[in-house]
């Protein structure tokens, strides 16, 4: 590994009201001549490691969350790794951790509030 | 490229405190990773410690959760472990290393003997 | 706690011979929620594989990683010298994080 993948979330929480779809943002820098064959990432829940959607070998792997989770696919190769969590419930409240790895790797924490 | 490196008593006496560093190099501990503890000993293998962000927000593994504090010094590009009341069972080799879900790179690792 | 179950305990194989490590989790997991890595004496372990199949920068392509569910498999194509060691799966979609006992690949 050359350097850590910087990955960038915002520093507030997310606050959405139950029902609502939420975004959880998630960023990082592609460096130039990137593929997203060469991306994995991988959301899940910060404390239990629990899968809740993934990227990897060039495709969307889908939702491992009750399947109300989808990425932006047209933004993936710009560097936007963020997650749409729909319908949101009290249950979602909690922390979600953003992994991404491109050769190296990087990771970040966005907390999700439930109104 | 990222390099860690341990440092710490290698002779801790039975109920006493394990304290290790672990000093980063060919990078910033500021940046989004996590910053782990790992132990191997020949009863137990390899047993993940615990963790820690930069934002100073640490994971314990259950078992060592009520001995184990992991704390971070950004200022001196370090992290350090604490495990208190040990025993001759926490006599291991002792690596930190980086990641939230697999670890890259390892540090060298150090042996800790605990025993009177 | 996911537990990782490693088999053989040693493998005793010639250069140039094909290895097949096997690591078996005491629950489903994701195949992208597990690593491999080599451990020579006196070194701290090497990531090998992640994902269950991307290689770690600079590791040959004779090692490739398999598996889904409970089953996971590592493969050395042709054993260079270099290669004899030990070698440990770890599950990374559960916390805590978790190893396997190790597989050692001894010479022959």
């Known amino acids: 590994p050359t350097g850590a993948v910087e990955v960038q979330v915002p520093e507030d929480p997310v606050v959405a009201l139950v029902g609502t779809d939420a975004t959880l943002r998630c960023s990082f820098s592609p460096e130039p001549g990137f593929s997203l064959a060469q991306l994995n990432l991988i959301w899940q829940l910060t404390d239990t490691k629990q899968l809740v959607h993934s990227f990897t070998e060039g495709r969307d792997q889908g939702s491992a969350y009750a399947n109300r989770t989808a990425l932006f696919p047209d933004l993936l190769a710009q560097g936007n790794a963020s997650l749409r969590l729909q319908r949101v419930r009290v249950a979602d409240e909690g922390s979600f951790t953003c992994f991404v790895s491109i050769r190296d790797f990087g990771s970040a924490a966005v907390s999700l509030q439930v109104a | 490229q990222v390099q860690l490196q341990e440092s710490g008593p290698g002779l801790v006496k039975p109920s006493g405190t394990l304290s290790l560093t672990c000093a980063v190099s060919?990078?910033?501990?500021?940046?989004?990773?996590?910053w782990n503890w790992v132990r191997q000993s020949p009863g137990k293998g390899l047993e993940w410690i615990g963790e820690?962000?930069?934002?100073?927000?640490?994971n314990y593994s259950p078992s060592l959760k009520s001995r184990v504090t992991i704390s971070i010094d950004k200022s001196k590009n370090q992290f350090s472990l604490k495990l208190n009341s040990v025993t001759a069972a926490d006599t291991a080799v002792y690596y930190c290393?980086?990641?939230?879900?697999?670890?890259?790179?390892w540090g060298q690792g150090t042996l800790v003997t605990v025993s009177s | 706690e996911i537990v990782l179950t490693q088999s053989p305990g040693t493998l005793s194989l010639s250069p140039g011979e094909r290895a097949t490590l096997s690591c078996r989790t005491s629950?489903?997991?994701?195949?992208?929620?597990l690593a491999w890595y080599q451990q020579k004496p006196g070194q701290a372990p090497r990531l090998l594989i992640y994902?269950?199949?991307s290689r770690a920068t600079g590791i040959p392509d004779r090692f490739s990683g398999s598996g889904s569910g409970t089953d996971f498999t590592l493969s050395i194509s042709r054993l260079e010298p270099e290669d004899f060691a030990v070698y440990y799966c770890?599950?990374?979609?559960?916390?805590?994080?978790?190893f396997g006992q190790g597989t050692k690949v001894e010479i022959k």
């Open positions: 290393a980086r990641g939230y879900n697999y670890f890259d790179p």
């Open positions: 060919g990078g910033s501990i500021s940046t989004s990773n996590y």
């Open positions: 820690i962000y930069p934002t100073g927000n640490t």
């Open positions: 629950q489903s997991i994701n195949a992208i929620l």
């Open positions: 994902g269950a199949s």
């Open positions: 770890q599950q990374y979609g559960s916390s805590p994080r978790t």
